[in-house]
Interface confidence: medium
């Protein structure tokens, strides 16, 4: 069953290359679980980037090795992407599963742009 | 090929304990909700309780409330029933059933089944 | 005292079809959620017949077909054979309850 999810078109990653936005789903039913999933669309190709699954009220919980951080707020999770660097720029989309109870719901957000500028290097100062 | 095997099935007294378990195998267990489903001698099916894939949400009959405790082992592939304070009523023949990849959509696999009989 | 109401029995012919009922509430077919349909041979477990109100698993003849309305479902059988001869179930979510509810089956008896 389908489900609207609603995330930012554009988002600028800062200069340590960090990037956050917010994903926001309409929820038809009373889910206990959810399961957000960010996604990676370049050049035709998607790629999971990071996923996790959390009870309502909780705090989400990444792996330890993700890039991802973030956290949730009734309907919204707010998400941060970090160690982002040029090369990442691309479509990044926010998938959203009502794992339980029933019915499973699942939706998928149009996608966040976000850009990625290498920060210029500091030129050596001369004292 | 999806298979699920109950065991720890028998024969135990009235207030007495019984843990059952669920050998699955053939799927990702850990990304499928979990489910007992009970049928005493000669009725219908009745659901027990379920588990979410995770474990993190579980759910349960209001005749078991507080007397069974559904739990599952993600890294063994394994679910169980742990029934306390059993009763007459609770003789049944107790399957383990699977719900489909779409997480909670409905009972697609079961067990064969372990019989359970609360007697003296 | 089953949540969802079938009927506790029917019959019929080799070669007849025979409808089976299934009427529930607010909570459950009414609310929304599909409706499942269990065949259960004597001595067996329960083996999905129908999923998600109309919906044959691989493997299912189209004989058994499955309908929905309001807050009542159908399992239709036509062309009936002798190895339909079984307990057959509905079953729906509902969301006062939390949990799965099931009909007290129909026992489906060819005769002849």
């Known amino acids: 069953k389908a489900m609207h999810v609603a995330q930012p078109a554009v988002v600028l990653a800062n200069s340590r290359g960090t990037a956050s936005f917010v994903c926001e789903y309409a929820s038809p039913g009373k889910a206990t679980e959810v399961r957000v999933t960010v996604l990676r669309q370049a050049d035709s190709q998607v790629t999971e980037v990071c996923a996790a699954t959390y009870m309502m009220g909780n705090e989400l919980t990444f792996l330890d090795d993700s890039i991802c951080t973030g956290t949730s707020s009734g309907n919204q999770v707010n998400l941060t992407i970090q160690g982002l660097r040029a090369m990442d720029t691309g479509l990044y989309i926010c998938k959203v599963e009502l794992m339980y109870p029933p019915p499973y719901y699942m939706g998928i957000g149009n996608g966040t742009q976000i850009y990625v500028i290498d920060p210029e290097p500091c030129p050596d100062s001369d004292f | 090929e999806v298979q699920l095997l109950e065991s720890g099935g028998g024969l135990v007294q009235p207030g007495g304990s019984l843990r059952l378990s669920c050998a699955a195998s053939?799927?990702?267990?850990?990304?499928?909700?979990m489910n007992w489903v009970r049928q005493a001698p000669g009725k219908g099916l009745e659901w027990v309780s379920a588990?979410?894939?995770?474990?993190?949400?579980?759910y349960y009959a209001d005749s078991v409330k507080g007397r069974f405790t559904i739990s599952r082992d993600n890294s063994k592939n394994t679910l169980y029933l742990q029934m306390n304070s059993l009763r007459a009523e609770d003789t049944a023949v107790y399957y383990c059933?699977?719900?489909?990849?779409?997480?909670?959509?409905?009972?697609?696999?079961w067990g064969q089944g372990t019989l359970v009989t609360v007697s003296s | 005292q089953s949540v969802l109401t079938q009927p506790p029995s029917a019959s019929g012919t080799p070669g007849q079809r025979v409808t089976i009922s299934c009427t529930g509430s607010?909570?459950?077919?009414?609310?929304?959620?599909?409706v499942h349909w269990y065949q259960q041979l004597p001595g067996t477990a329960p083996k999905l017949l129908i999923y998600?109100?109309?919906q044959r698993p691989s493997g299912v003849p189209d004989r058994f077909s499955g309908s929905k309305s309001g807050t009542s479902a159908s399992l239709a059988i036509s062309g009936l054979r002798s190895e339909d001869e079984a307990d057959y179930y509905c079953?729906?979510?509902?969301?006062?309850?939390?949990?799965?509810?099931f009909g007290g089956g129909t026992k489906l008896t060819v005769l002849g």
């Open positions: 079953a729906a979510w509902d969301d006062s309850l939390n949990g799965w509810v």
């Open positions: 053939g799927f990702t267990f850990s990304s499928y909700s």
């Open positions: 998600r109100n109309n």
């Open positions: 607010s909570s459950n077919i009414g609310a929304g959620y599909d």
């Open positions: 588990i979410s894939g995770s474990g993190g949400s579980t």
């Open positions: 059933a699977r719900d489909r990849v779409e997480m909670n959509q409905w009972l697609a696999d």
